[in-house]
Interface confidence: low
Amino acid sequence: YDFTNCDFEKIKAAYLSTISKDLITYMSGTKSTEFNNTVSCSNRPHCLTEIQSLTFNPTAGCASLAKEMFAMKTKAALAIWCPGYSETQINATQAMKKRRKRKVTTNKCLEQVSQLQGLWRRFNRPLLKQQ
């Protein structure tokens, strides 16, 4: 999906009002310094591409993020403020429902959510020079 035509300010508002709090809740019990941020993005469409990938694509050691509260709110924000996004996700969501069995949060998931927090922070500061 091409995130170029999304309403970035509305997505930013959704992040600041709820998604950010849910990410913090998920990470409760971990220090911000516990994980090094290795994933980055260069502009807002790129950030949303990476956020979408890390949130909804199962990775080795962490297959359980898609049903978390922050993930569901991310999905809703993208569906509302990115034209045509929800249509592209129907098949992916059905496949995910078949695959998912039980919720088990691992250290790998915590690391992944820590990366997501970094991507979202970057998304909110698009004019900031890349480190």
Partner: antibody
Framework: EVQLVESGGGLVQPGGSLRLSCAAS????????MTWVRQAPGKGLEWVSS????????YYADSVKGRFTISRDNAKNSLSLQMNSLRAEDTAVYYC??????????????WGQGVLVTVSS | DIVMTQTPLSLSVTPGEPASISCRSS???????????LHWYLQKPGQSPQLLIY???HRASGVPDRFSGSGSDTDFTLKISRVEAEDVGVYYC?????????FGGGTKVEIK
């Protein structure tokens, strides 16, 4: 096989100290929060202390706060409970358990066989 | 602190018959993340406790499907659809919403 094995229990006088150890095997110890639970003779279960996977956060029951210290060594796959200023009411079987943090719903999915601590003069 | 209250204290059940244990918390166990932090354990005679149900209704690995958990907020129930001889022991509920974590007083299940 996932296993937790406690050691270090025994008889100690009131005011004395004891150090319990728990050896973990069969799973990636550093991924999991750990918890000590105790059970006084003929009584129910009582949560004692929990430590998060990277020791970032530590919690204690009010009944042991200031007297007990939980710690872990992820390199050695071991959990410890240092018990000082022991009282008669600390007499119990102490269980080392896996879990107790937000990440696994807090449920304790693996339990050791338990170790008896008797505080008596 | 959250207080957990279990009823009944003891239960005598005929093999093959259903059994039900209630657990009540002094405040809601629903977290803002949508999960309810209530778990059930069984301690068989002479053994360490074992996890049966986590987060209200999820059966732990290896737990027979005759065990089921339900409830919300402050009222929870553990049901055994058909009690077997191996189900005897003391059942405990536990909340891990906030520290200090706390267990119910236990319900002893015996076979008639």
């Amino acid at each position: 096989e996932v296993q937790l094995v406690e050691s270090g229990g025994g008889l100690v006088q009131p005011g004395g100290s004891l150090r319990l150890s728990c050896a973990a095997s069969g799973f990636t110890f550093s991924n999991y929060d750990m918890t000590w639970v105790r059970q006084a003779p003929g009584k129910g279960l009582e949560w004692v202390s929990s430590i998060t996977f990277a020791s970032s956060y530590i919690y204690y029951a009010d009944s042991v706060k200031g007297r007990f210290t939980i710690s872990r060594d992820n390199a050695k796959n071991s959990l410890s409970l240092q018990m000082n200023s022991l009282r008669a009411e600390d007499t119990a079987v102490y269980y080392c358990t896996r879990g107790g943090g937000a990440y696994h719903g807090g449920s304790l999915d693996v339990w050791g066989q338990g170790v008896l601590v008797t505080v008596s003069s | 602190d959250i207080v957990m209250t279990q009823t009944p204290l003891s239960l005598s059940v005929t093999p093959g018959e259903p059994a039900s244990i209630s657990c009540r918390s002094s405040q809601s166990l629903l977290h803002i993340n949508g999960y309810t932090y209530l778990h059930w354990y069984l301690q068989k005679p002479g053994q360490s406790p074992q996890l049966l149900i986590y987060l209200v209704s999820h059966r732990a690995s290896g737990v027979p499907d005759r065990f089921s958990g339900s409830g919300s907020d402050t009222d929870f129930t553990l049901k055994i659809s058909r009690v077997e001889a191996e189900d005897v022991g003391v059942y405990y509920c536990e909340q891990t919403l906030q520290t200090p974590y706390s267990f119910g007083g236990g319900t002893k299940v015996e076979i008639k």
